[in-house]
């Protein structure tokens, strides 16, 4: 038997991802355990393998069908149960019934790309995936800027409060290297939480020309 | 401002059939579900039919096999075909859609309509 506190959380990406976090203080390593969701409403049912991210955590993403389908609605409850073997049973570990969106995550921002580099400024845009159809153009990003010599922890957070799909950062030094991220979250949902940070764009602002004051 | 207009419902016999409509109309919205709901007096209100994105029909255990719900998306209507209807069926009949505006999810009712079935 595995004893210890249980903390089962989900997310739904919006369209046909569910993520999944197990974790279970005293957990026996080698057990195979997975996430087995079943909806309400819907005729599929769907499973993933649960793998270890850490010592005494595991995770899986429940595939629900192709990345842009509409898979689930506001009405939809998906009860979701970590199953884990038990010689030839399967034991129930920690169960939710899991309404998708009141628990949104969105997938990070993709194709981030400089659109234009100056000395002290620079145009970055990027692009939303898997966003449901329902939110429309009613979301909001933030973004932070890594300068040399700090953490992206110490990056202040830029908001935009509104579907802008690009940024035009400042008062930048010049020939300076620089990193930058950005995140994206849904109005909707009680539980809803900031999509990870997208992979960090570099980029370096233009050197000043010489001998102009700039 | 959205508004939800009902129609079809009235008074009909037992084992007769009925047809109801509801039109959802308003400023900009995209709907993910649309259903019909109904009222006896002294009692709660209860899911009768609703139908989600997706095609996934939900039905009251009292109804199912007798009542058929349609959704147009397009038309933003929602229909409710009733059939073998018994007096146990009569109350009044909400309409009831999902709405998202501006990026938020909220429910809308409609007036009701009554359906009446006698013995």
């Known amino acids: 038997a595995v004893n210890g506190t249980s903390q089962f959380t989900c997310f739904y990406n919006s369209r046909a991802n569910i993520s999944c976090v197990w974790s279970q203080d005293g957990a026996l390593q080698d057990t195979s355990c997975q996430v087995h969701a079943w909806p309400d409403r819907r005729r599929w049912n769907q499973t993933c393998e649960l793998l270890p991210v850490s010592q005494a955590s595991w995770a899986c993403n429940l595939i629900l069908g192709a990345p842009d389908s509409q898979k689930l609605t506001t009405v939809d409850i998906v009860t979701l149960r970590v199953l884990c073997r038990e010689g030839v049973r399967w034991r129930v570990m920690a169960i939710q019934d899991f309404k998708p969106f009141e628990n949104l995550r969105l997938m990070a921002p993709i194709s981030l790309q400089v659109v234009h580099v100056e000395t002290h400024r620079c145009n970055i845009s990027w692009e939303i995936s898997q966003a449901s159809h329902y939110f429309e153009r009613h979301l909001e990003f933030e973004a932070r800027t890594l300068s040399p010599g700090h953490t992206w922890e110490e990056a202040p957070l830029l908001t935009l409060k509104q579907k802008q799909e690009w940024i035009c950062l400042e008062t930048l030094t010049p020939d300076t290297q620089y990193e930058f991220q950005v995140r994206v979250k849904p109005l909707q949902g009680e539980f809803t939480t900031w999509s990870p940070w997208s992979q960090p764009l570099a980029f370096r602002t233009k050197p000043a020309a010489l001998g102009k004051d700039t | 401002q959205v508004q939800l207009v009902e129609s079809g419902g009235g008074l009909v016999q037992t084992g007769g059939s009925l047809r109801l409509s509801c039109v959802v109309s308003?400023?900009?919205?995209?709907?993910?579900?649309m259903g019909w709901y109904r009222q006896v007096p002294g009692k709660q209100r209860e899911l009768v039919a609703d139908?989600?994105?997706?095609?996934?029909?939900k039905y009251g255990d009292s109804v199912k096999g007798r009542f058929t719900i349609l959704r147009d998306s397009v038309k933003n209507t929602v229909y409710l075909q009733m059939s073998s209807l018994n007096p146990e069926d009569t109350g009044v009949y909400y309409c009831?859609?999902?709405?998202?505006?501006?990026?938020?999810?909220?429910?809308?009712w409609g007036q009701g309509t009554q359906v009446t079935v006698s013995s």
């Open positions: 139908m989600a994105d997706g095609g996934s029909a």
């Open positions: 308003g400023s900009h919205f995209i709907s993910d579900v």
């Open positions: 009831k859609a999902g709405l998202w505006i501006t990026g938020r999810h909220s429910d809308y």
